[in-house]
Amino acid sequence: DAEFRHDSGYEVHHQKLVFFAEDVGSNKGAIIGLMVGGVV
């Protein structure tokens, strides 16, 4: 299982750091169902 380290805001996932609980300011659509940016 992945080791979660949210003190740093990062999760260790298969030896790779990825920011999971992302800032709502992220334009990548990390929040399920939240409309982000304009439709391209």
């Epitope: 990390a30 939240l34 982000v36 391209v40």
Partner: antibody, heavy 112, light 111 residues
């Protein structure tokens, strides 16, 4: 009209695999993460994982790590989820989600 | 896994009256960055789910302001100030502090 259109219902035997598609219509699927969730009959929602179509990076819930494989074909604006080694417990409606758009859901029934 | 527990599981409501749903997480969803990673979704009958509230108290686009959400790090409440017929369905709380997990759902129906 902007929408995500999923492939139709599937009936599979235990042990088989199934590949569900999610096509962006009026929507560039490359721009945002594509999430996949499932809803068991008369039950709640489970998050399977997500893929970043830009680079193919995936994150899975541990229980789906060996069950689901997420891919994207950016040339056709289509995301895919393949489920392997199907069991009756995998009978569910599967949803794709990207930005504020949800697919209509695909019912996968596993039965012998 | 962070476990999300909702109550009640069924909530008969009267149109025009207020209603509330509770959700508890097995771990605090308040991150050191000040954000609380708690979400509310509604699944209307025969439809895909939709996002209502994100990061505990932010209303998603197009959601009527009769919906509101509040809470601490582990205890949360979704409130509907005046229930309308279109509000029926199953409400789910969810967290994404550590991946995503959902509550078991609360069915809201008209009395």
């Amino acid at each position: 009209q902007v929408q995500l259109v999923q492939s139709g219902a599937e009936v599979k035997e235990p042990g088989a695999s199934v590949k569900v598609s999610c096509k962006g219509s009026g929507f560039n699927i490359k721009t945002y993460y594509v999430h996949w969730l499932r809803q068991l009959p008369e039950k709640g929602l489970e998050w399977i994982g997500r893929i970043d179509p830009e680079n193919g990076e995936t994150i899975y819930t541990p229980k789906f790590q060996d069950k689901a494989t997420l891919t994207v074909d950016t040339s056709t604006d289509t995301a895919y989820m393949e489920l392997s080694s199907l069991r009756s417990e995998d009978t569910a409606v599967y949803y794709c989600v990207s930005s504020g758009y949800w697919g209509q859901g695909t019912l996968v029934t596993v039965s012998s | 896994d962070i476990v999300m527990t909702q109550s009640p599981l069924s909530n008969p409501v009267t149109p025009g009256e207020p209603a509330s749903i509770s959700c508890r997480s097995s771990k605090s969803l308040l991150h050191r960055n000040g954000k609380t990673y708690l979400y509310w979704y509604l699944q209307k009958p025969g439809q895909s789910p939709q996002l209502l509230i994100y990061q505990m108290d932010h209303l998603a686009s197009g959601v009527p302001d009769r919906f509101s959400s509040s809470g601490s790090g582990t205890d949360f409440t979704l409130k509907i100030s005046r229930v309308e017929a279109e509000d029926v369905g199953v409400y789910y709380c969810a967290q994404n502090l550590e991946l995503w997990t959902f509550g078991q759902g609360t069915k809201v129906e008209i009395k």
